[in-house]
């Protein structure tokens, strides 16, 4: 459509242009996780704040029960940061005890669930060994990329250890997606 | 407007479509920081290169005095990476000396200032304990997310210790934003 | 063009609006790297999966021979994550041997090649010292930012040590770009 002239003497069919402000978008922020039941053999999913503070959902992008619901097919940029904090990892104790030194680790996974698929799809994974010397450690894992999603897909964020997630501030741990 | 036909026999009101190339955008790159006065109880703000090398501002997105100025309300993707480098943190020394083992840390905050608000808003924070064994360490903290901003909002990047920022290369430490 | 009325009694010249679905986009995922010849004095470039699983290229964005080819001038968001994994770095051994304690490191660079330029341009760099206590370590480096690219530019991802790249899962190591 670049710089093209349209004579008004006949009808025009327009390409699917759309106002950017109408696109599905969400930015979710951390809330404290309360002990709950998780699916067996799957990292626990985080739940999120979706309307207070910096958090929002708009243009039919809805948040419900730990999931972001994709309202429209297209290419989405999806991102999350999870800040973890913990005490000295058991790594050094394991090493001292002369057992094999398997490091502790922290992992974040952004997962897509499609109702017609039996298995969730892991879209993004950030995983890091933690073998800290100090007694208290903290660090973020950031992820972000573009994916082709279908209307009805659901997105969630799973973590390896839910009790190490820093829930104190909305700028430390968050999850978002927007249609490109 | 998807695939809709427009008969030329009457006036049309168009949705707020706009050329993507007209949207406010900026990518700023690191410069050597000169010692300046900082606000009390606030991490120091970095200043940036805005026109040389890879850096640019366009479409009324201006950079002035450590701030990116938001020229138009809307949803923006904001990102920054800060690469830190330092000598061994005092962490191990503190521990050996028997003092409380509070780890050193490095922190990046992307902050929004709105003139009508008394307090800045922390949009994004990346914070990491540093308890390195090696004598020289270096590592990046990356942040990025989407926020609803208002015309006139100002964005800055604050760091916990300005003297640890690696200012040597424009690809190591940077700050950007673009209207979605 | 916001909310503006267009009378059909004369021809209109339209700004370069374009359907978002038509924009060049790619998300590439990791494959096992086969030993190849690398350019002297340059980190080796990764090669990628471009059509299986989560990977795709669309709208004239092509992948060939380790490069993403930019088909159209404009501002692109470019991102990559590389997950590294290795055994204990030699850092501690070096220190014990009384030699200067230069830490091991891992580095990712997103590089632009323009045929008319003799030298590649480093757009983004993530670099991290590795001085891990544990015998096995793993960690990601994430990068992402916006750049003005020209038609014909080529993008690649270079790493400091190709043998440390975790090629096991498409969600751990990836590379993408999209026109804004």
């Amino acid at each position: 459509l670049k710089g093209q002239e349209f004579a008004p003497s006949h009808q025009q069919v327009y390409a699917p242009l759309r106002a950017d402000g109408d696109k599905p978008r969400a930015h979710l922020t951390v809330v404290r996780q309360t002990p709950t039941q998780h699916f067996k053999n799957q990292f626990p999913a985080l739940h999120w704040e979706h309307e207070l503070g910096l958090a929002f959902t708009k243009n039919r992008m809805n948040y419900t029960n730990k999931f972001l619901l994709i309202p429209e097919s297209g290419d989405y940029f999806i991102y999350s940061q999870v800040t973890f904090r913990g005490m000295t990892s058991e790594c050094s104790e394991i090493r001292q005890a002369g057992r094999p030194n398997k490091p502790d680790s922290i992992t974040v996974v952004i997962t897509k669930v499609t109702d017609s698929y039996p298995e969730p799809t892991q879209l993004l994974m950030g995983t890091k060994s933690v073998c800290e010397v100090g007694s208290n450690w903290f660090q973020p894992i950031y992820l972000g990329a573009m994916f082709s999603l279908q209307e009805g897909d659901k997105l969630m964020v799973n973590v390896s250890d839910i009790s190490l997630v820093d829930y104190t501030k909305e700028d430390k741990t968050f999850f978002g997606a927007f249609l490109l | 407007l998807k695939g809709q036909e427009f008969a030329p026999s009457h006036q049309q009101v168009y949705a707020p479509l706009r050329a993507d190339g007209d949207k406010p955008r900026a990518h700023l790159t690191v410069v050597r920081q000169t010692p300046t006065q900082h606000f009390k109880n606030q991490f120091p703000a970095l200043h940036w290169e805005h026109e040389l090398g890879l850096a640019f501002t366009k479409n009324r997105m201006n950079y002035t005095n450590k701030f990116l100025l938001i020229p138009e309300s809307g949803d923006y993707f904001i990102y920054s990476q800060v690469t830190f480098r330092g000598m061994t943190s005092e962490c191990s020394e503190i521990r050996q000396a028997g003092r409380p083992n509070k780890p050193d840390s490095i922190t990046v905050v992307i902050t929004k200032v709105t003139d009508s608000y008394p307090e800045p808003t922390q949009l994004l924070m990346g914070t990491k304990s540093v308890c390195e064994v090696g004598s020289n360490w270096f590592q990046p903290i990356y942040l990025g997310a989407m926020f609803s901003l208002q015309e006139g909002d100002k964005l800055m990047v604050n760091v916990s210790d300005i003297s640890l920022v690696d200012y040597t290369k424009e690809d190591k430490t940077f700050f950007g934003a673009f209207l979605l | 063009l916001k909310g503006q009325e267009f009378a059909p009694s004369h021809q209109q010249v339209y700004a370069p609006l374009r359907a978002d679905g038509d924009k060049p986009r790619a998300h590439l995922t990791v494959v096992r790297q086969t030993p190849t010849q690398h350019f002297k004095n340059q980190f080796p470039a990764l090669h990628w999966e471009h059509e299986l699983g989560l990977a795709f290229t669309k709208n004239r964005m092509n992948y060939t021979n380790k490069f993403l080819l930019i088909p159209e001038s404009g501002d692109y968001f470019i991102y990559s994550q590389v997950t590294f994994r290795g055994m204990t770095s030699e850092c501690s051994e070096i220190r014990q041997a009384g030699r200067p304690n230069k830490p091991d490191s891992i580095t990712v660079v997103i590089t632009k090649v323009t045929d008319s330029y003799p030298e590649p341009t480093q757009l983004l760099m993530g670099t991290k010292s590795v001085c891990e206590v544990g015998s096995n370590w793993f960690q990601p480096i994430y990068l992402g930012a916006m750049f003005s690219l020209q038609e014909g530019d080529k993008l690649m991802v270079n790493v400091s040590d190709i043998s440390l790249v975790d090629y096991t899962k498409e969600d751990k190591t990836f590379f993408g770009a999209f026109l804004l």
């Epitope: 309360t34 002990p35 709950t36 626990p44 104790e93 007694s135 208290n136 009790s163 | - | -």
Partner: antibody
Framework: QVQLVQSEAEVKKPGASVKVSCKAS????????IHWVRQAPGQGLEWMGW????????NYAQKFQDRVTMTGDTSISTAYMELRRLRSDDTAVYYC???????????WGQGTMVTVSS | DIQMTQSPSSLSASVGDRVTITCRAS??????LNWYQQKPGKAPKFLIY???RLQSGVPSRFSGSGSGTDFTLTISSLQPEDFATYYC?????????FGPGTKVDIK
């Protein structure tokens, strides 16, 4: 709903050991740390330590380091706290608690009174 | 170890009163500060986390503030069921420590 049910009250002689149990239900036992906190009669709360039921990892307050052992049995979603070489000043109500994060205590057991008396 | 102090150690108040309890840490604990309520013969109940964020199900008359070393728990309008002992607890570093408690009783 989430519940922690503790074992019954115990009376012990000085020098003996006590093992208090804490049965969890209503949540995934391995996903959250279990803490032990005690409260002497008329006194405040004192944190003793935690166990990560998933890894078996523990963190004890220095004061109890050489006398306490915290364990877990994931097959029956139960945590245990054993305190050895009991003294009269160990007389207290012992609580187990679970936190949505490892640094706080969302849900508490009903408490187990341990009396140490000769 | 991080020491936690509370003031006052006890206070008498009437239904409808605004009550403020302060808690101080011996070193900075950022916002890793939690508040609990305990009634006689009962286990403590979790009220506030992260210094200022209300635990699910806790009435909005409870609020918390502070960061670093100084923190406050406020009950905006005291209700009959609020007469209890209140404890602060730091979750910044091990060993986790509690304040000595503040007893709120009927005037």
């Amino acid at each position: 709903q989430v519940q922690l049910v503790q074992s019954e009250a115990e009376v012990k002689k000085p020098g003996a050991s006590v093992k208090v149990s804490c049965k969890a239900s209503g949540y995934t036992f391995t996903a959250y740390y279990i803490h032990w906190v005690r409260q002497a009669p008329g006194q405040g709360l004192e944190w003793m330590g935690w166990i990560n039921p998933n890894s078996g990892g523990t963190n004890y307050a220095q004061k109890f380091q050489d006398r306490v052992t915290m364990t877990g049995d994931t097959s029956i979603s139960t945590a245990y706290m054993e305190l050895r070489r009991l003294r009269s000043d160990d007389t207290a109500v012992y609580y187990c608690a679970v936190g949505g994060s490892y640094d706080a205590f969302d849900i508490w057991g009903q408490g187990t009174m341990v009396t140490v008396s000769s | 170890d991080i020491q936690m102090t509370q003031s006052p150690s006890s206070l008498s108040a009437s239904v409808g009163d605004r009550v403020t309890i302060t808690c101080r840490a011996s070193q900075s604990i950022s916002s890793y500060l939690n508040w609990y309520q305990q009634k006689p013969g009962k286990a403590p109940k979790f009220l506030i986390y992260g210094a200022s964020r209300l635990q699910s199900g806790v009435p909005s008359r409870f609020s918390g503030s502070g960061s670093g070393t100084d923190f406050t728990l406020t009950i905006s309008s005291l209700q009959p069921e609020d007469f209890a002992t209140y404890y602060c607890q730091q979750g910044y570093s091990s060993p986790f420590t509690f304040g000595p408690g503040t007893k709120v009783d009927i005037k």
